[in-house]
Every structure is written in C-alpha cells, then in structure tokens.
C-alpha cells in the first residue's frame, strides 16, 4: 500500500503517523494543529531580562540580549570588551550604547587600527559618513 | 542596582598614611571600567587623583598624584587607594566613581571624608 | 590640561536661560569627550552631558550641551529652583587622563 507519510504532510518538523484509518502529526514543542501547521506563541509569557527582546523560533524562545548582558534569559553579564576590540593598547569600554574604545597615544580610529603620522596626519581611509574616532560600534 | 560605596575615611596626623577601600555591588570588574579616585576638598571643586583599568590592571595618575598615591584592584569588586605622606591640604572627600566609555562618570560612591590634622 | 568655567556664579529668573561655558587648554579625546555635572551641598556630582552634547539617561531636556574640542557650553532653558546647584565640566584626554573644571555655581531666583 502506498505510504501516506511519504508526502510530509506535517509541518515544521512534525512526525507523520501512518495509523491506516488516519494519519496522525506529533508535533514537535512550540507547534500545534492537525498537521502542526501552528506556530504557537513561543514568547508569551516568557521574559528577557536587561532589556533583552524574546525572538521566536524553532519552537523554543530565544533572546535577543542588550549589549552587555548574554545567557538564555539575558541574565548574565556578558563583557562585549573580552575580545579585546580595540588594537594597540586601546582601552575598551562598555558603554550602554556600544562598546566604546579610548586610544592609546599614536593611535586613532573606532578601533584604535590606524597610526597616527607624527605631522598630526593619520592612515585613516575615508570613514564613513558622520563616522569619529571612539564613536561606538553597535 | 550598581553601587559604588567608599569605606576607611577618617582622622589622620599630618606624614600618615591611610587606605580607602571602594565596594562593588550590582556589578563586578570582570568587565572592562576604569575604576577611579576623585577628591574633593571643602567648598572646591572636584579633583581627579588616579584610576585602575580593569581590563589589563593598568593604572593612571595625576601628575601631583604620582608617588604619594597608588591605585590597585584588591578583588572582583574592590579597588584600594593607598596614600602615604598625607597633608592637611590632602582633607577632602574622597570619591570612588567608574568611567564607562566616553571618559565620563556615570556612577558615584557617596564619598568618604578624610581629615588630615594635628 | 586645564579647564575653566565662567562665569561664576551665575544667577537666573525661574523659566530664564542660563549659559555656562568651559574651555580647555587643549583638545579633549576625539575632539568631544567633555561632560557636565550638577553638584548639591552633601551630594557627589551627577552626569547631565556625556560626549558634548549627549543627554544622560533620566536628565530633563532643558539641559543641552554643545561645542567640540577647546571650547563647550552648557545651557539650561526654562531654568527651575530645582536646578540651583553647582555646576562643573569634565574632560577626558589622550593618554588616559581626566580633569575638571573649577565649577560655577547657578543661582535661581
């Protein structure tokens, strides 16, 4: 007999049950229906600290962390300074609007990557528009 | 909440010495802060003494502050600041306050006095 | 690096404009890292400006700053009782340093 299951009637990952008198979908966690064609609500009720934004998703709830905090629940402090952004001695802040870098004398750029020329001038390529050194990278 | 809080303030005889001791809460110097000093003497403005970068340990001082002061981190949530040779000009408020980015202090402890006198 | 405030002190009607300037002997870090500070008797300073001209989380808009590199500016439109204070201006300068203005004090009557 032909097998019904073959023609993934189920969505989003379900597992097709070929029960002869009807098919049946299990549907994995976060979806519903008879062919787990619902994608039920995976952020209700469910809260991100720290200003943290819930993301829907595979049927499990995701935060989307703010600069500074990390972990499934944005409840740890996460440091965006630990891969040492800012290049040559630069020092790094975390500042709620970015990270933030202060270069070390010599040095300028949002990352401290460029020389500069003992005239005053610098490597700099042309930055982008309303782009200064120390301005924040998001 | 963060919070800063000074601790070690008090009545000092003039070529003593005396350490402050600043208390993290709310957050810890596993991130990247300068962890500063400001002094601030009766009826003037403040004054910016020293600061420790808790992301390599280096510190900072200003000029009149080399020698006699030495900022240090003492744990996760405590800095000390260590002043020898003190003065009666040395009587002051003293400060604890953390640089985020921007050079700026945004968060303060409540200060603690230090009098320096015979 | 040194910075000065003028003038001092200041005096305001209540809902007047005050205007308080500070000019350093050189140029602050990336020609805007300057910040200004409300002080009240007993109190540590508190953040009004950050970068020149950023408003601090919380501050009311009344406050507004300005100017780059030597020269800056802190302006207080509609000025209220709540707003007698001392003020001062706050620099940060290549090599890690920091330094404060002297401070002026604003009166609101």
């Known amino acids: 007999r032909v097998d019904r299951c073959s023609l993934q009637p189920c969505r989003n990952g379900g597992l097709c049950l070929d029960l002869g008198h009807a098919l049946r979908c299990r549907c994995r966690a976060g979806f519903a229906g008879p062919r787990c064609e619902h994608d039920l609500d995976d952020c209700a009720g469910r809260a991100c600290a720290n200003g943290g934004t819930c993301v829907e998703g595979g049927g499990a709830h995701r935060c989307s962390c703010a600069l500074g905090f990390g972990g499934r629940d944005c409840r740890e402090r996460a440091d965006p300074c630990a891969a040492r952004p800012c290049a040559h001695g630069g020092r790094c802040y975390a500042h709620f609007s970015g990270l933030v870098c202060a270069c070390a004398p010599g040095y300028m750029g949002a990352r401290c990557e460029f020389p500069v020329h003992p005239d005053g001038a610098s490597a700099l390529p042309a930055a982008p528009p309303g782009l200064r050194p120390g301005d924040p990278q998001r | 909440q963060e919070q800063l809080v000074e601790s070690g303030g008090g009545l000092v005889q003039p070529e003593g010495s005396l350490t402050l001791t600043c208390t993290a809460s709310?957050?810890?110097?596993?991130?990247?802060?300068?962890m500063c000093w400001v002094r601030q003497a009766p009826g003037k403005g403040p004054e910016w003494i020293a600061c420790i970068y808790t992301g390599d340990g280096s510190t900072d001082y200003a000029s009149w502050a080399k020698g006699r002061f030495t900022v240090s981190k003492a744990s996760s949530t405590t800095v000390t600041l260590q002043m020898t040779s003190l003065a009666v000009a040395d009587t002051a408020t003293y400060f604890c306050?953390?640089?985020?980015?921007?050079?700026?202090?945004?968060?303060w402890g409540p200060g603690t006095l230090v009098t320096v006198s015979s | 690096q040194v910075l000065t405030q003028t003038p001092s002190p200041v005096s305001a009607a209540v809902g007047g404009t005050v205007t308080i300037s500070c000019q350093s002997t050189e140029s602050v870090y990336g020609s805007d890292w300057l910040s200004w500070y409300q002080q009240k008797p007993g109190q540590p300073p508190k953040v009004l400006i950050y970068q020149a001209s950023n408003l601090e989380i919380g501050v009311p808009s009344r406050f507004k700053g300005s100017g780059s590199g030597t020269q800056f500016t802190l302006t207080i439109s509609g000025a209220q009782c709540d707003d007698a204070a001392t003020y001062y201006c706050q620099g940060y300068y290549s090599g890690y340093i920091y330094a404060f203005g002297g401070g002026t004090e604003v009166v609101v009557k």
């Open positions: 709310g957050f810890s110097f596993s991130s990247s802060y300068d």
């Open positions: 306050a953390r640089n985020s980015g921007y050079g700026y202090f945004g968060l």
